[in-house]
């Protein structure tokens, strides 16, 4: 094994080129200068290096930059990025959106890896907030990115960034996340007129309070059932039958198909059967006529 440590005569790499794919691992180790590799990183991605060969190249860069790679190298890592561990990435200081895009491109079409998650975390923390350009970039590569953040992390999203959010970006968000995003969206879209406003705010409504739903019911918005089913149950329960009818418009007929599911089921239980009958949909389970409804929660609050 000793003789393998020296680079064979005539094999010393003068540049990073395709001839290196024919080098054995030990030859790459012995014949490629780390400084040369660092200055010609942009060529690595153009050459079909194998998994094992990339391991050797990474080892060379690690020796050259034990404290972490400079951004000039990081930007050109290409497929070598896939060899990095989250620990490696935590040593980096990535400030350029172009660098972030270049590395996300490497993993495009594949689910978010721990490396990518660490990279994004480092980048966003470095910027201090999730600005519009960053959010645009992240959701373009990972539509579910926003919903992978905790409510605490989402609180750092400025309202101006909400313009970058597409409906599909919110598909996997839970109510706690929408509770944080909805007020930001309301603020971001506040200067839009009725119908345009509703189109933009619709995907965020899973975080809307009762009073906002009541206000929307006065604006002929014709909310579809899919949106209605994603509303917070506690926000839907206080709505009257008339308000729900106005909110849904022609889509109100869809309530019948959803009468066994939340929030429709719970809402029906809170309505007078007389009022439900006015919809003519055959909804059953409301409060029978003549019964008195006591709000025990209100009583407890008073006592």
């Amino acid at each position: 094994e000793v003789e393998k440590t020296a680079c064979p005569s005539g094999k010393k790499a003068r540049e990073i080129d395709e001839s290196l794919i024919f080098y054995k691992k030990w030859e790459l180790e012995a014949c490629v200068d780390a400084a040369l590799l660092a200055t010609q990183m942009d060529r690595v991605n153009a050459i079909p290096f194998t998994y094992e060969q990339l391991d050797v190249l990474k080892h060379k860069l690690d020796e050259l930059y034990p404290q972490g790679y400079p951004e000039s190298v990081i930007q050109h890592l290409g497929y070598l990025f896939l060899k990095m561990s989250p620990e490696d990435i935590r040593k980096w200081n990535v400030t350029s959106l172009e660098t972030l895009k270049a590395l996300l491109e490497v993993n495009k079409g594949h689910e978010m890896s721990p490396q990518v998650a660490t990279l994004i975390d480092r980048f966003v923390k470095g910027r201090g907030q999730l600005d519009k350009d960053t959010l645009d970039t992240l959701t373009a590569f990972y539509p579910g990115y926003l919903c992978s953040l905790s409510p605490e992390e989402l609180s750092s999203v400025p309202p101006s960034s909400i313009w970058a959010v597409r409906p599909q970006d919110l598909d996997t968000c839970d109510p706690r996340q929408l509770d944080v995003l909805y007020p930001k969206a309301r603020l971001a879209f506040q200067n839009m007129n009725g119908s345009e406003y509703f189109v933009k705010i619709q995907s965020f409504l899973g975080g809307a309070p009762t009073e906002d739903l009541k206000a929307l019911s006065q604006q002929n918005v014709s909310m579809d059932l899919a949106t209605f089913m994603k509303l917070r149950t506690d926000a839907v329960l206080p709505l009257t039958v008339a308000e729900v009818q106005k909110l849904l418009g022609p889509h109100v007929e869809g309530l019948k198909a959803e009468e066994r599911h939340r929030p429709v089921r719970d809402w029906i239980l809170r309505q007078r059967q007389d009022d439900l009958d006015t919809l003519g949909l055959g909804l059953q389970g409301g409060i029978p006529n003549g019964y008195l409804v006591l709000d025990l929660s209100m009583q407890e609050a008073l006592s």
Epitope: N45, A46, P48, T50, Y51, L82
Partner: nanobody, 114 residues
Framework: VQLVESGGGLVQPGGSLRLSCAAS????????VAWYRQAPGEQREPVAA???????IYADSVKGRFTISRDNAKNTVYLQMNSLKPEDTAVYYC??????????WGQGTSVTVS
């Protein structure tokens, strides 16, 4: 990323074969790609490669006999093999980009020269 190699078979010495490698996604058009082969009991070795810029390179043992090419529209890489020799007998694989970096390989296509 899925890689499906085809075109292998049994051929006499001096004969020709054209191997194809169909890839899902846009792997072929945007990435450097290469053909590799693995003979029984041997390690997998590169045979021919094409950089993302389109330049080609060949192992000394196949220079002048093999040609690598690609069709971006069909997302397919080819290996034209002429003047085949018994020592070219192996399972041939193509790879590139993400799958190569992640060490994901297709099933390969078997070539026997006898």
């Amino acid at each position: 990323v899925q890689l499906v190699e085809s075109g292998g078979g049994l051929v006499q010495p001096g004969g020709s074969l054209r191997l194809s490698c169909a890839a899902s996604g846009s792997m072929v058009s945007i990435n450097a790609v290469a053909w590799y082969r693995q003979a029984p009991g041997e390690q997998r070795e590169p045979v021919a490669a094409m950089t993302s810029g389109g330049s080609t390179i060949y192992a000394d043992s196949v220079k002048g006999r093999f040609t690598i090419s690609r069709d971006n529209a069909k997302n397919t890489v080819y290996l034209q093999m002429n003047s085949l020799k018994p020592e070219d007998t192996a399972v041939y694989y193509c790879n590139g980009g993400w799958s190569l970096a992640m060490d994901y390989w297709g099933q390969g296509t078997s070539v026997t020269v006898s």
